[in-house]
């Protein structure tokens, strides 16, 4: 009889432990759900607010038609400038038309005055041809005005309203370009 009681007591004890575990799991699960809910709400909030505030260009970028431009506040050599633009999901500026050139030079005059700014133009060492970074050729009116007397690689830059060339290892400001976001409204 005593043995039977002690077996029942042990079973009850086991049941109690299992229930405690279940309660603990439930509490943990509830906490996890609450955290997930909080995360989801925050995520939704961010998405909604960014959708609400979505401007065609990021902060500190300038818009013109379908493009956004970033004028750097630091100097770097041409290759580092290229990487700095890539980090921002953009490429070095590629000037497609005289209108775009006029917009850029006009904006630079307002922002900084007469400094040198790397653009995505470089000269092929073998052929001497000027090419934009995507491999396309500049239009005839957008070729650098002077040939750099450099044995090193030569890259293009904008100064005042001219496109010029220089040794790619010199330090200059730079301009990045990306596409403007289309408004979904």
């Amino acid at each position: 009889k005593l043995l039977q009681v002690s077996t029942i007591a042990m079973q009850q004890q086991e049941k109690l432990i299992q229930q405690e575990r279940a309660l603990l799991n439930f509490t943990e699960w509830k906490r996890s759900c609450a955290l997930q809910m909080k995360y989801c709400q925050a995520f939704m909030q961010n998405s909604l607010s960014s959708a609400h505030n979505s401007s065609p260009c990021p902060n500190n970028w300038i818009q013109n038609r379908e493009s956004c431009y970033y004028v750097s506040e630091i100097w770097s050599i041409w290759h580092t400038s290229q990487e700095n633009c890539l980090k921002e999901g953009s490429t070095l500026l590629q000037i497609e038309s005289k209108e775009e050139m006029d917009f850029i030079t006009g904006s630079l005059r307002k922002i900084k005055g007469s400094y040198d700014y790397w653009v995505g133009l470089s000269q092929d060492g073998h052929s001497g041809r000027w090419l934009w970074q995507d491999g396309s050729s500049p239009s005839p009116g957008l070729l650098p005005a002077e040939r750099s007397q450099s044995a090193n690689q030569v890259c293009g830059y904008v100064k005042s309203n001219s496109l010029l060339s220089s040794n790619c290892s010199t330090w200059k400001y730079f301009i990045c370009e990306k596409y403007a976001l289309r408004s979904s409204v």
């Epitope: 990487e83 890539l86 980090k87 921002e88 999901g89 953009s90 490429t91 970074q133 995507d134 491999g135 370009e177 990306k178 596409y179």
Partner: nanobody
Framework: QVQLQESGGGLVQAGGSLRLSCAAS????????IGWYRQAPGKQRELVAA???????TYADSVKGRFTISRDNAKNTVYLQMDSLKSEDTAVYYC?????????WGQGTQVTVSS
């Protein structure tokens, strides 16, 4: 954390073609700029080509007109199509993910062009 894995390297004759792939696991690649770099023995690692999340492309002068970078967001993969290969293209090719806060690299794939 994003894991990048390159594939498609190998031995090819001068004038031949190869297509390298850079596949990602751990996160979607679609919001990142992805670049292909290469490093030949005794030389510095150099940028070969890159493609932004918007599809803007940039190429090194030495590969313009021969290499093409593209991306397939559905497959979470970026490709480098290499045509008219030259012996100077021999190197280990790496892909790199760019973001404003951090960069991440793959392990690399060897490309050997024999003349």
């Amino acid at each position: 954390q994003v894991q990048l894995q390159e594939s498609g390297g190998g031995l090819v004759q001068a004038g031949g073609s190869l297509r390298l792939s850079c596949a990602a696991s751990g996160r979607t690649l679609s919001s990142y700029t992805i670049g292909w770099y290469r490093q030949a023995p005794g030389k510095q690692r150099e940028l070969v080509a890159a493609i932004t999340n918007q599809g803007r492309r940039t190429y090194a002068d030495s590969v313009k007109g021969r290499f093409t970078i593209s991306r397939d967001n559905a497959k979470n993969t970026v490709y480098l199509q290499m045509d008219s290969l030259k012996s100077e293209d021999t190197a280990v090719y790496y892909c790199k993910g760019f973001s404003p806060t951090d960069d991440f690299w793959g392990q690399g794939t060897q490309v050997t062009v024999s003349s």
